[in-house]
């Protein structure tokens, strides 16, 4: 807290300019009018105020706007945004995408801070849903943003926004998140032709059910092993050897290198060894010939 002292003669600030960096903390407090600061916030960013001087400026704005800053001030906070606490930001009502971009720019190239997370939360809640422009902006600054959301939060993403998603935006998504995103992607890309559709849907396939994988196997898509390894195990298990062969095309040879890893390992255990042998890859661990396969899950469902 800065002590209240009278402004020395001739030091009253007429505008926010670089002469203020030579003011001591108490002089800033006494000589800079909060309303003047608020209307000239855009100048602060261009002036190399010290860390302690920025404390004084923030204190003045807090006194002027105890209920939270108006968006006209927020948009021009610049690096003063980094002085804000999540509690400060929860008082804000940020509706403009330009304001959001301006503040994200200050944190560019760094991990999402609690302040940024709170800002985004306030912005998205204010909009009611994650529209395409917002998603475009957020994933540009934070490629992992989408995967930081809970499945519940992802459910508010409209299918039209899926067009903004790039493959790298989904790198850290877990199966639960892809389960929510996949149906939206399927809807978003439904009018595309076979090969174009596969290129777009590929990143989301970790949420695809068995029937969709079966349908893809009929379309000569040549899925790569990296994509195959990210598929849901429960979706892969019912696929036949012939379906997997069609799904992977020339990439089927990669199964040998992955035979000890899920979902390949579990899938092999469900296939007849005879069928696996037809691939000519030396995959071992299938059901020996002459054995009867009982579907215990079906039996449990009936009892």
């Amino acid at each position: 807290e800065v002590e209240k002292t009278a402004c020395p003669s001739g030091k009253k600030a007429r505008e926010i300019d670089e002469s203020l960096i030579f003011y001591k903390k108490w002089e800033l407090e006494a000589c800079v009018d909060a309303a003047l600061l608020a209307t000239q916030m855009d100048r602060v960013n261009a002036i190399p105020f010290t860390y302690e001087q920025l404390d004084v400026l923030k204190h003045k704005l807090d006194e002027l706007y105890p209920q939270g800053y108006p968006e006209s001030v927020i948009q021009h906070l610049g690096y003063l945004f980094l002085k804000m606490s999540p509690e400060d930001i929860r008082k804000w009502n940020v509706t403009s995408l330009e304001t959001l971009k301006a503040l994200l720019e200050v944190n560019k190239g760094h991990e999402m801070s609690p302040q940024v997370a709170t800002l985004i939360d306030r912005f998205v809640k204010g909009r009611g849903q994650l529209d395409k422009d917002t998603l475009d902006t957020l994933t540009a600054f934070y490629p992992g943003y989408l995967c930081s959301l809970s499945p519940e939060e992802l459910s508010s993403v409209p299918p039209s926004s899926i067009w903004a998603v790039r493959p790298q935006d989904l790198d850290t998504c877990d199966p639960r998140q892809l389960d929510v995103l996949y149906p939206k992607a399927r809807l978003a890309f439904q009018n595309m032709n076979g090969s174009e559709y596969f290129v777009k849907i590929q990143s989301f396939l970790g949420g695809a059910p068995t029937e969709d994988l079966k349908a893809l196997s009929q379309q000569n898509v040549s899925m790569d092993l990296a994509t195959f390894m990210k598929l849901r195990t429960d979706a892969v298990l019912p696929l036949t050897v012939a379906e997997v062969q069609k799904l992977l095309g020339p990439h089927v040879e990669g199964l040998k290198a992955e035979e000890r890893h899920r979902p390949v390992r579990d899938w092999i255990l469900r296939q007849r060894q005879d069928d696996l042998d037809t691939l000519g890859l030396g995959l071992q661990g299938g059901i020996p010939n002459g054995y009867l396969v009982l579907d215990l899950s079906m039996q449990e469902a009936l009892s």
Partner: nanobody, 118 residues
């Protein structure tokens, strides 16, 4: 981590000149501004000169026309050329830099003593 090492201080006669250098290392972020502060015996810290990333310079009234701040971006070094020195310029001079992207932080050197004898 960031280190600022000042050099060039010393004892000089009134009316003489000195050139202070500040070598910065460990910088992995865009620097917003470099500056020089001084602390005269028994007084508080006073900002003497500052140079922004874009090269804009600002000086305290007491040193205008006598001191010049400059920077060498290649070597991450900041200089303070001090001319027409007076006893009022005696003190410890500290180099400092501002980080304003990703986090707000000011980094300081250990200081170099400047003594102007009359």
């Amino acid at each position: 981590q960031v280190q600022l090492v000042e050099s060039g201080g010393g004892l000089v006669q009134a009316g003489g000149s000195l050139r202070l250098s500040c070598a910065a290392s460990g910088i992995t972020f865009p620097v917003n501004a470099y500056g020089w502060y001084r602390q005269a015996p028994g007084k508080g810290l006073e900002l003497v000169a500052i140079i922004s990333a874009g090269g804009t310079t600002n000086y305290a009234d007491s040193v205008k026309g006598r001191f010049a701040i400059s920077k060498d971006n290649v070597n991450n070094t900041v200089y303070l050329q001090m001319n027409s020195l007076t006893s009022e310029d005696t003190g410890v001079y500290y180099c400092y830099l501002q980080r304003r992207i990703g986090m707000l932080r000011d980094y300081w050197g250990q200081g170099t003593q400047v003594t102007v004898s009359s």
